[in-house]
Interface confidence: low
């Protein structure tokens, strides 16, 4: 807690400059007024502080708004968020995308912090929905983002969302966020013609039922090795040989590398030998 | 370090046919999907044909669709796109160009071959 | 298709200015969008992909913002290298399409 002195004679602040630089932390607290400090907050970022004097502003700020600082500051508080905890943001409401983004901005190149991930909560249920422009902002910044959503918020995920999903951002999804996410994928490319579509629908395909894989290997989808073995084994396994290598194309070979992993192993397992013959591959059910 | 080295570009009269390669190294080819994009003398840039890390999947842009043919042999890192038919307006120079790890995207450019479609 | 409108096609400026190019979709695009540089007689250069993330090796004065159908590259210092055509590419959907492109000339 910083002691409360008087402002020494002609040291009150005018206006928030770099001279506040060689303010010590008792000098700061006596002599910036919290209101000018909240109307200037974009000029505080555009002075080298230090951590210490940083402290002091944001305390001051703390006691001009106790409730929480109003979406004006927090849009310009650039790296004195890296001082907020958790339970000063819960107390925040931000609405705009151009405040998250500045605050995302701060934090880039970083891991997700708590801090990060409560702004993150808070501006989503604020919003009651994960929109598309969100998305994008969010995966921007954090490519694993949708991945660390649980299968119940990814629910709340609108189709119109899944055009701003890139490949990479469902690297990390397990296969109940890809059960999820997949038929909001299929809703949201369903317009698109048949290659465009598998282009889009591949990194979603690890929520495919069979029928679907079914209906994809009468399109010469050529799907790659890597793609297939991140396919449902319970979706896998009805397929028959024939619809496997119509699926596959020409990368139907690369079953022969993966023969002892699954879903390879398994569907093997469940094909006639007269049927894997017909691959001439060598395959052993 | 990533080189493309374009080949096969120009002279040839209308209504002829050239086939241009694309020579890649310093990179895993068969990794990354490719792309051709041409710009005419004194234009800007236009995106011609795109293909899939194992050839199965090709774009076209429609100005070319129906006389354009992009392929790739990725056991000699190399791009392909054979160009029947050609016209006055095809003649640009050439480029292949890398899709980068952002879907879309081109990271890495060759230097370009000049394609001249003229009687 | 989708089309891409730049502005200016055109501008001058001078060594240590700051520089803004704009670029508009025809339809949204999220955030697929790339730009690229190219100076006479050479190949581009990728600078930006993802609207505002910068590729490997790009100096940090070349950003990039913005979303939907609403895009800017920023050349925050502007140096003699930088004189150069700038494109910008959405990647949303096939076919791929660029700008018309942004010459950006010595004062």
């Known amino acids: 807690e910083v002691e409360k002195t008087a402002c020494p004679s002609g040291k009150k602040a005018r206006e928030i400059d770099e001279s506040l630089i060689f303010y010590k932390k008792w000098e700061l607290e006596a002599c910036v007024d919290a209101a000018l400090l909240a109307t200037q907050m974009d000029r505080v970022n555009a002075i080298p502080f230090t951590y210490e004097q940083l402290d002091v502003l944001k305390h001051k700020l703390d006691e001009l708004y106790p409730q929480g600082y109003p979406e004006s500051v927090i849009q310009h508080l650039g790296y004195l968020f890296l001082k907020m905890s958790p339970e000063d943001i819960r107390k925040w409401n931000v609405t705009s995308l151009e405040t998250l983004k500045a605050l995302l901005e701060v934090n880039k190149g970083h891991e997700m912090s708590p801090q990060v991930a409560t702004l993150i909560d808070r501006f989503v249920k604020g919003r009651g929905q994960l929109d598309k422009d969100t998305l994008d902002t969010l995966t921007a910044f954090y490519p694993g983002y949708l991945c660390s959503l649980s299968p119940e918020e990814l629910s709340s995920v609108p189709p119109s969302s899944i055009w701003a999903v890139r490949p990479q951002d469902l690297d990390t999804c397990d296969p109940r966020q890809l059960d999820v996410l997949y038929p909001k994928a299929r809703l949201a490319f369903q317009n698109m013609n048949g290659s465009e579509y598998f282009v889009k629908i591949q990194s979603f395909l690890g929520g495919a039922p069979t029928e679907d894989l079914k209906a994809l290997s009468q399109q010469n989808v050529s799907m790659d090795l890597a793609t297939f073995m991140k396919l449902r084994t319970d979706a896998v396994l009805p397929l028959t040989v024939a619809e496997v290598q119509k699926l596959l194309g020409p990368h139907v070979e690369g079953l022969k590398a993966e023969e002892r992993h699954r879903p390879v192993r398994d569907w093997i397992l469940r094909q006639r030998q007269d049927d894997l013959d017909t691959l001439g591959l060598g395959l052993q059910g | 370090e990533v080189q493309l080295l374009e080949s096969g570009g120009g002279l040839v009269q209308p209504g002829g046919s050239l086939r241009l390669s694309c020579a890649a190294s310093?990179?895993?080819?068969?990794?990354?999907?490719m792309t051709w994009v041409r710009q005419a003398p004194g234009k800007g840039l236009e995106w011609v044909s795109g293909?899939?890390?194992?050839?199965?999947?090709?774009y076209y842009a429609s100005s070319v669709k129906g006389r354009f043919t992009i392929s790739r042999d990725n056991s000699k890192n190399t791009l392909y796109l054979q160009m029947n038919s050609l016209r006055a307006e095809d003649t640009a120079v050439y480029y292949c160009?890398?899709?980068?790890?952002?879907?879309?995207?081109?990271?890495?450019w060759g230097q370009g071959t000049l394609v001249t479609v003229s009687s | 298709d989708i089309q891409m409108t730049q502005s200016p096609s055109s501008l001058s400026a001078s060594v240590g200015d700051r520089v803004t190019i704009t670029c508009r979709s025809s339809?949204?695009?999220?955030?697929?969008l790339a730009w690229y540089q190219q100076k006479p007689e050479k190949a581009p250069q990728s600078l930006i992909y993802a609207a505002s993330s910068l590729q490997s090796g790009v100096p940090s004065r070349f950003s990039g913002s913005g979303s939907g159908t609403d895009f800017t590259l920023t050349i925050s210092n502007l140096q003699p290298e930088d004189f150069a055509t700038y494109y910008c590419?959405?990647?949303?959907?096939?076919?791929?399409?660029f700008g018309g492109g942004t010459k950006v000339e010595i004062k």
């Open positions: 293909i899939s890390v194992s050839g199965g999947i090709t």
């Open positions: 160009a890398k899709r980068g790890a952002a879907v879309g995207s081109f990271d890495y």
């Open positions: 339809q949204g695009i999220g955030s697929w």
């Open positions: 310093g990179l895993t080819f068969r990794s990354y999907a």
């Open positions: 590419q959405q990647y949303n959907s096939y076919p791929l399409t």
